[in-house]
């Protein structure tokens, strides 16, 4: 039997409280063949901002067609966790699942979606919904990439030299300058998967009085500027 899996698209909305919610579900164009079975096996990578809520969806198959619904969750450095619902007996079962923030959205017989409340760096991993029907399994897989917004600082540390830092971002931010200077960039990797990027630039040309540091990141972009003083100036700091 075919083992379909389908591409997804990120939709972001604001809930009533401050926490943003991402739903990795969509109506999509499907690849169909004999008997209208979907044959595409696609695992999709999706970025999700840290501290938001995320909802992951199964393929659109009615409960009346199902035997078992299983979510398989593989997180780095942990045993594979499975959450299963058996329709015939109306029972749910969990194996090796320790993170209480990863749950069914509601009763599986009403909604097969999986939710992650307050996404953390530790939720980086692979999530797969497996829908077992009498004629085979339908799959939908997600490679979840947790995004962390870096803290951006810009300061002058020597005569006509500025330092721009994007601290503890995930993935690493990209730093560029206007105007371009004589720059050196270093990256520092932390054990939790975040990266600090430090760019130090020097401008010999004396008609350059103001410089701008532009930080590009998947969570958003930020620009800071500073006046080049003959002596070290004030420190500037911002979140993306």
């Amino acid at each position: 039997a075919a083992q379909p899996n389908n591409s997804l698209m990120l939709q972001t909305s604001k809930e009533n409280h401050a926490l943003a919610s991402s739903s990795l579900c969509m109506d999509e164009k499907q690849i169909t063949q004999n008997y209208s079975k979907v044959l595409a096996e696609v695992n999709t990578s999706w970025p999700v901002k840290m501290a938001t809520n995320a909802v992951l969806c199964c393929p659109p198959i009615a409960l009346r067609n199902l035997i078992i619904i299983t979510w398989e969750i593989i997180l780095r450095g942990q045993p594979s966790c499975t959450k299963a619902y058996k329709k015939e007996t109306n029972e749910t079962k969990e194996t090796n699942c320790t993170d209480e923030r990863i749950t069914w959205v509601s009763r599986p017989d009403q909604n097969s979606d999986l939710q992650i409340r307050t996404v953390a760096i530790t939720h980086d991993g692979y999530y797969r919904c497996i829908m077992v029907t009498p004629d085979g399994n339908f799959h939908r897989g997600y490679h979840l990439q947790v995004l962390v917004t870096p803290e951006v600082t810009l300061f002058q540390n020597r005569n006509r030299t500025a330092v721009c830092k994007a601290v503890a971002g995930k993935p690493a931010a990209h730093i560029s300058w206007i105007p371009e200077g004589d720059c050196a960039t270093k990256q520092e990797y932390w054990s939790n998967g975040t990266v600090t990027v430090k760019s130090t630039c020097h401008w010999e040309v004396h008609n350059v009085s103001t410089v701008t540091c532009h930080v590009s990141h998947l969570t958003g972009n930020k620009s800071l500027y500073i006046e080049l003083l003959p002596v070290p100036g004030a420190k500037k700091s911002a979140k993306l």
């Epitope: 579900c25 109506d27 079975k37």
Partner: antibody
Framework: QVQLVQSGAEVKKPGASVKVSCKAS????????MHWVRQAPGQGLEWMGY????????NYNEKFKGRVTMTRDTSTSTVYMELSSLRSEDTAVYYC????????????WGQGTLVTVSS | DIVLTQSPASLAVSPGQRATITCRAS??????????MHWYQQKPGQPPKLLIY???NLESGVPARFSGSGSGTDFTLTINPVEANDTANYYC????????FGQGTKVEIK
């Protein structure tokens, strides 16, 4: 290919019962839910209910509960729809339709069976 | 039960023009990012034929002149450009809960 072949036209008297058959071929019969829909002359489509041949589950439209029975025979890959206590307004073409998994859409239909209820 | 209301009841269109049929549900037929709304074409003496599933997906073998859109409670079937053999009745159907059909739209080609 997937095919649904229904039984022939029927003429029934009011109060009688009718049993329409729908024979499936070209796929694993027990794997797919089968729906029944009817269409009165010059009218729209009306869902009657479904049977899941895999586990014999049935679900009927409230309007037909108590009068309709859907059954299946796995040895002949056939589903049946029986409607009792017939009245003239039950005169219609009755269709079976197979539900495809993805999106619960109905991709394959029988050719239809005309049931006429007349005294 | 979810009630589906189609409009208009009938429609006359010239070949090459656009035909638009709408279907409104009494409550949302969308869940988990999917809209469980489908569109069928029925010609006289024939069973219905699936055109569009899950609101916007074209069934295999159906011409790209047919398209569907919408989510939640409001959906549209568009035929563009219309051809002479598109004369038929068109029905929306939902499978969010127990299945129901719209009352149908009769499309005639001028």
């Amino acid at each position: 290919q997937v095919q649904l072949v229904q039984s022939g036209a029927e003429v029934k008297k009011p109060g009688a019962s009718v049993k329409v058959s729908c024979k499936a071929s070209g796929y694993t019969f027990t794997s797919y839910v089968m729906h029944w829909v009817r269409q009165a002359p010059g009218q729209g489509l009306e869902w009657m209910g479904y049977i899941n041949p895999y586990n014999d589950d049935t679900n009927y439209n409230e309007k037909f509960k108590g009068r309709v029975t859907m059954t299946r025979d796995t040895s002949t890959s056939t589903v049946y729809m029986e409607l009792s206590s017939l009245r003239s307004e039950d005169t219609a073409v009755y269709y079976c339709a197979r539900e495809d998994y993805y999106g619960s859409r109905w991709g394959t239909w029988g050719q239809g069976t005309l049931v006429t209820v007349s005294s | 039960d979810i009630v589906l209301t189609q409009s208009p009841a009938s429609l006359a269109v010239s070949p090459g023009q656009r035909a638009t049929i709408t279907c409104r549900a009494s409550k949302s037929v969308s869940t988990s990012g999917y809209s469980y709304m489908h569109w069928y074409q029925q010609k006289p003496g024939q069973p219905p034929k699936l055109l569009i599933y899950l609101a916007s997906n074209l069934e295999s073998g159906v011409p790209a002149r047919f398209s569907g859109s919408g989510s939640g409670t409001d959906f549209t079937l568009t035929i563009n450009p219309v051809e002479a053999n598109d004369t038929a009745n068109y029905y929306c159907q939902h499978s969010r809960e127990l299945d129901t059909f719209g009352q149908g739209t009769k499309v005639e080609i001028k």
